[in-house]
Interface confidence: low
């Protein structure tokens, strides 16, 4: 049974002396007149064994000392610390020349933990070892004890075990306390990389490179290694490991990150509070939950606060004229804490009986700068039908508006389009051609703008280039034009009146009369 | 609406693997915002939390201590389902499973329930 | 042993109002959100109250759950019939890094 004494972490021992209860019982030979094991008080009072051989008198000694078998660990390299005293020479009488300071180190390696005898000849020299302190005999009356330590290594080691042996040639010693040895880097966190417990290299220069794992929670940026030096000492330390999302480095290790706290990304540093509108309720959270109302967009960062989307316009003013509506408003009061407002306006073609019944007004409505992604705060409306109510939505919308559409983030306005002129006619025909006459055919304008009144007809000889025209006027949609000279080129135009005026005339129509009787009956806009 | 549709043996032998299923519907397995979780119930424990899995840029589990050595929960993306598989099963391990769905800490849906007996 | 204590059983007559208590530590409802489920006989539990005192749409507002400390509390008005069941705390427990369960209080209805 051994007793535990606290020695450097780096050092791993593999026999202490001091640390044995009870005897040693470890070989001597001769079996008696050479060492012998002898208990002693330590500083501290307490009992140790010792081994002491103090043949000084007699010429030609060899006495050795074999320890129990000594188990290698894996180590390649060990260490052998001998503290112990040694009396001086010189201050025993009649002994000249048999009695010596120093002994000598040896060790065999062995598979073998039960060989009984010490065979000289298996036995390696490590050292001779001499004492830096010899003691007198008036040191020992006032019982100063000088005691020597020396340390000598030994390696590479190969086999399972070995053996120490201790030779005196006739010195007067005490081995106080033998231990061995052997050096490890011990186990150690470095940039939350954990490095193990490793043995040192077989020779006193020799690095051992070791690959680190990462703690828990966390993952590898670069590769960690270290070097284990041949003393026992970590260097070089390369590579890290980062806190895995969710975590953060307190104390060498990754622990979660705290309720009401988050960390997106392992290369964040530390967990942050959750912004603004945003809660965690879960340890280790790796992004915030907004709150109720409020949202993140697709391209949010984890770090953004949550937004809502904003309030409604305000102030929303509509100028009419005639079939056009100039639409102006100021930004919301709230912009749902965002910077990417933007407007959208919806256009609803309403009853004038039931202004409920609404409908959407078409592709006809023209929208200037824009209909939808307005960045300006108004908007010019064109193309509109008159006498007709219109029923107008401003949107006010941002980054999150499509996670909660509501008619809060709109205002509207009801108007009505003034009387207009009509739109101009697309589309007239000759129905019939004679020598002195044409017959026309036309359609009504697209947008008549209230009740026509009455289709104007202007023409004129191609060649006259509208110096000199006649008019005729009817109801109708349609007119017979008469009194024109054969075989010759005339251009037509019709346009329509309501009580809002004149609308634009249509396009040219081109149409030679005939030479002979005979009609000719076309349906082109250029009927020869 | 979210359903989830467990599956696997009602009978386990004592020292054997202990395996269910829970299929999802109207939700994703690797969804950022829910966690995928697996609980017993029987007479002498009541409600046990056995652990989860969920995904925020990679896959996490955690797992109770009670089952820690023992407990394996495997998401799979292709079929949107999670698995529990417990080894080394005794007769304590006797008990209604139920996999429920964890958004932000309260277990919103479950599962049917999967009576497991462990018995030879 | 529960890490939550519930009492095992409540009682009252329909139409009547009972509380059910759920009590912890700092490392779990101190810290923490509490949910409450109700049980019915031969089902999965179903959840009542998140977050302590919201209602998930479809429960009625007989429901409710407040928080104080260490422990909390589910509510019931208008008790009927229907509501005869099991009923349960959870929350996340820091300390443990799990979630934990009261062990339960079975609900009568007179």
């Known amino acids: 049974v051994t007793g535990s004494r606290v020695y450097p972490a780096n050092e791993v021992t593999l026999l202490d002396s001091r640390s044995v209860q009870g005897e040693l019982g470890w070989i001597a030979s001769p079996l008696e007149g050479g060492w012998e094991e002898v208990s002693i008080m330590d500083e501290k009072n307490t009992p140790i064994r010792t081994y002491q051989v103090c043949n000084v008198m007699e010429p030609s000694q060899n006495n050795w000392l074999r320890t129990d078998w000594i188990t290698r660990e894996g180590a390649q390299r060990v260490y052998i610390e001998i503290k112990f005293t040694l009396r001086d020479c010189n201050s025993l009488p009649g002994v000249m020349g048999t009695c010596k300071e120093t002994f000598n180190l040896y060790y065999y390696e062995s598979d073998n933990d039960k060989e009984r005898f010490i065979r000289e000849n298996q036995f390696v020299k490590i050292d001779t070892i001499a004492a830096d302190e010899s003691f007198t005999q008036v040191d020992i009356g006032d019982r100063i004890m000088k005691l020597n330590t020396e340390i000598r290594d030994v390696g590479p080691l190969s086999k399972k075990g070995f053996y120490l042996a201790f030779q005196d040639v006739g010195a007067c010693i005490a081995l106080v306390s033998v231990r061995v040895f052997y050096k490890k880097c011990p186990l150690t966190v470095r940039n939350l990389a954990q490095f193990p417990d490793t043995i040192t290299g077989a020779d006193t220069s020799s690095l051992v490179e070791v690959r680190g794992s990462c703690v828990n929670n966390s993952e590898e940026k670069d590769v960690p290694k270290m070097y284990c030096g041949a003393d026992g000492e970590w260097l070089v330390p390369i590579g890290n490991c980062l806190c895995n999302a969710g975590h953060e480095e307190r104390s060498g290790e990754c622990q979660a990150c705290k309720i009401g706290y988050y960390k997106a990304l392992s290369t964040d540093a530390t967990c942050a509070k959750c912004p603004p509108h945003s809660y965690s309720v879960w340890e280790g959270a790796t992004s915030c939950t907004c709150d109720r109302g409020f949202f993140r967009a697709d391209n949010d960062a984890a770090s953004m606060p949550c937004t809502r989307p904003p309030s409604a316009p305000l102030n929303l003013i509509s100028n009419v004229n005639e079939t056009s509506v100039n639409l102006e408003w100021s930004s919301p009061q709230n912009t749902g804490g965002r910077q990417d407002i933007s407007y959208n306006v919806v256009c609803k073609k309403c009853g004038a009986g039931d202004p409920s019944k609404c409908r959407p007004c078409g592709s006809g409505v023209h929208y200037t700068p824009q209909q939808n992604g307005l960045k300006t705060t108004k908007v010019s409306i064109t193309d509109l039908l008159a006498h007709t109510n219109y029923t107008f939505e401003i949107w006010a919308v941002n980054g999150v508006s499509k996670y909660n559409p509501n008619p809060d983030q709109s205002v509207s306005v009801t108007v009505t389009t003034n009387q207009a002129a009509p739109s101009s006619i697309a589309l007239v025909q000759a129905k019939e051609v004679t020598r002195y006459s044409v017959a026309l055919a036309w359609l009504e304008p697209d947008r008549p703008n209230g009740v026509i009144l009455e289709y104007e007809v202007k023409y004129y000889e191609k060649d006259q280039n509208e110096r000199s025209y006649r008019i005729v006027r009817t109801a109708a949609r349609n007119t017979d034009i008469k009194g024109l000279n054969p075989l010759t080129s005339y251009v037509f135009h019709v346009r329509a009146r309501t009580a809002a005026g004149y609308g634009d005339f249509s396009e040219p129509l081109e149409v030679t009369t005939n030479t002979v009787p005979s009609r000719i009956i076309g349906d082109g806009a250029n009927s020869t | 609406q979210v359903q989830l549709q467990q599956s696997g043996p009602g009978l386990v032998k004592p020292s054997q693997t202990l395996s269910l299923t829970c299929a999802i519907s109207?939700?994703?397995?690797?969804?950022?915002?829910?966690?995928w979780n697996w609980i017993r119930q029987s007479p002498s424990r009541g409600l046990e939390w056995l652990g989860r899995?969920?995904?925020?840029?990679?896959?996490?589990?955690d797992y109770a201590v009670s089952v820690k050595s023992r407990i394996t929960i495997n998401p799979d993306t292709s079929k949107n389902q999670f698995s529990l598989q417990l080894n080394s099963v005794t007769p304590e391990d006797t008990a209604v499973y139920y996999c429920?769905?964890?958004?932000?800490?309260?277990?919103?849906?479950w599962g049917q329930g999967t009576l497991v007996t462990v018995s030879s | 042993q529960s890490v939550l204590t519930q009492p095992p059983s409540v009682s009252a007559a329909p139409g009547q109002k009972v509380t059910i208590s759920c009590s912890g530590s700092?490392?779990?409802?101190?810290?923490?959100?509490v949910s409450w489920y109700q049980q019915l006989p031969g089902t999965a539990p179903k959840l009542l109250i998140y977050?302590?005192?919201k209602r998930p749409s479809g429960i009625p507002d007989r429901f409710s759950g407040s928080k104080s400390g260490t422990s909390a509390t589910l509510g019931i008005t208008g008790l009927q019939t229907g509501d005869e069941a099991d009923y349960y705390c959870?929350?996340?427990?820091?300390?443990?890094?799990?979630?934990?369960f009261g062990g339960g209080t079975k609900l009568t209805v007179l």
């Open positions: 959870g929350t996340w427990d820091s300390s443990l890094s799990a979630v934990v």
């Open positions: 977050d302590n005192n």
């Open positions: 899995t969920y995904y925020r840029s990679k896959w996490y589990n």
């Open positions: 109207g939700d994703s397995v690797s969804s950022n915002s829910a966690a």
């Open positions: 700092s490392s779990n409802i101190g810290n923490n959100y």
């Open positions: 429920a769905r964890d958004s932000l800490r309260s277990f919103d849906y």
